[in-house]
């Protein structure tokens, strides 16, 4: 099952993944890979951590900007392009046979939305973003249609992943567009 996240070309994409170190400070290796989680490890690795720090990044655009030492291993991809679209695997490599937690997150990169005058803004956004978030068969199905463009902060507990989607609200406010 995949959690879906939308980002605009040129912006930073945030792909959430976290775990709770037990006991606190007892970190485990984590890898992020492009493509659905395979049987073992990560294929097409974009970033890897060991028990202490990030030790492998395939590009300077990949970052862990959260509190890594508290188990926030959410991936930030800077300056995304359409080629960054696709499924990413966050694999929390808990010691033991077949103990890994595997989280698939789908990144959808879109071209920047055109900010139009207020009367057509809501209609354009609704047609452009009919589905802000969907989760797979094992997770809660949520559909956000941006009528009032709310901020969403959803915790998908069965993935131990906290998905935070900050909609276009703030950007639109900053642009001076009217939101109704």
């Amino acid at each position: 099952s995949e959690v879906e996240y939308i980002a605009e070309v040129g912006q930073n994409a945030y792909l959430p993944c976290s775990y709770t170190p037990a006991p606190p400070g007892n970190l485990v290796p984590v890898c992020w890979g492009k493509g659905a989680c395979p049987v073992f490890d990560c294929s097409n690795v974009v970033l890897r951590t060991d028990n202490r720090d990030v030790n492998d990044r395939t590009s300077g655009r990949y970052w862990l900007k959260g509190d890594f030492h508290k188990g926030d291993v959410s991936l930030t991809i800077e300056n995304v392009t359409l080629a960054d679209s696709g499924v990413y695997c966050c694999r929390i490599q808990i010691p033991g046979i077949m103990n890994d937690e595997k989280h698939n997150v789908k990144l959808v990169v879109i071209k920047p939305a055109k900010v139009t005058p207020a009367p057509t803004l809501q209609r354009d956004l609704t047609s452009a973003f009919p589905r802000m978030l969907t989760t797979g068969e094992h997770g809660p199905a949520e559909t956000q249609t941006p009528g009032s463009l709310p901020d969403v902060n959803l915790t998908v507990s069965n993935f131990f992943c906290e998905l935070q989607i900050f909609t276009l609200t703030n950007e639109l406010r900053d642009s001076g567009a009217t939101i109704r």
């Epitope: 493509g35 659905a36 395979p38 049987v39 073992f40 490890d41 294929s43 499924v87 033991g96």
Partner: antibody, heavy 116, light 107 residues
Framework: EVQLVESGGGLVQPGGSLRLSCAAS????????MSWVRQAPGKGLEWVAN????????YYVDSVKGRFTISRDSAKNSLYLQMNSLRAEDTAMYFC?????????WGQGTLVTVSS | ETVMTQSPATLSVSPGERATLSCRAS??????LAWYQRKPGQAPRLLIY???TRATGIPARFSGSGSGTEFTLTISSLQSEDFAVYYC?????????FGGGTKVEIK
């Protein structure tokens, strides 16, 4: 250049044992999972076993569980497969492969023949 | 386990022609599928991984497609060195499994 060189194959009687070795070079051995894959005469490829970078996890196809043991020595850049209680159906060419879930580099293989 | 079925078992093609090989999985393997080429007396060679990504040094005439349960390997214009046996392999589900192979022979 990545190189994987297998050795240790040969003719063995049913119930016997063999130890295969694979010498790796040209890459950071300790950074990769490693696998053994085999191909019986006239048959297709079959994954046999693999081992994590630090040796902490090992996985086997059901048909060899309890009989085969995979191990590695990162100081020697070597991978091993200890094969006990060998059966006629274990007759195959055994390949050592670098494991990225898919197998991006392979050795030339070593032939194991189990026959009385 | 995930059973991988390849078809046809044998494909007779003339040099310069297009070859299309099929691989079907008994359950979804997402895009976690690889293709290999095996020639007699040689080690298998990785051609494609992640369903459609060519491995290092693989000519552009080899291409892969598909996701879920249906996959295709296409050789756009067969060269003499392409006559071999081709295997698909899934790495989405445990255990790792291969297809039975497709032999591409000269027509």
């Amino acid at each position: 250049e990545v190189q994987l060189v297998e050795s240790g194959g040969g003719l063995v009687q049913p119930g016997g044992s063999l130890r295969l070795s694979c010498a790796a070079s040209g890459f950071t051995f300790s950074s990769y999972w490693m696998s053994w894959v085999r191909q019986a005469p006239g048959k297709g490829l079959e994954w046999v076993a693999n081992i994590k970078q630090d040796g902490s996890e090992k996985y086997y196809v059901d048909s060899v569980k309890g009989r085969f043991t995979i191990s590695r020595d990162s100081a020697k850049n070597s991978l091993y497969l200890q094969m006990n209680s060998l059966r006629a159906e274990d007759t195959a060419m055994y390949f050592c492969a670098r494991d990225s879930n898919f197998f991006d580099y392979w050795g030339q293989g070593t032939l194991v023949t189990v026959s009385s | 386990e995930t059973v991988m079925t390849q078809s046809p078992a044998t494909l007779s093609v003339s040099p310069g022609e297009r070859a299309t090989l099929s691989c079907r999985a008994s359950q979804s393997v997402s895009s976690n599928l690889a293709w290999y080429q095996r020639k007699p007396g040689q080690a298998p060679r990785l051609l494609i991984y992640f369903s459609s990504t060519r491995a290092t040094g693989i000519p552009a005439r080899f291409s892969g497609s598909g996701s879920g349960t249906e996959f295709t390997l296409t050789i756009s214009s067969l060269q003499s060195e392409d006559f071999a046996v081709y295997y698909c392999q899934q790495y989405n589900n445990w255990p790792l499994t291969f297809g039975g192979g497709t032999k591409v022979e000269i027509k």
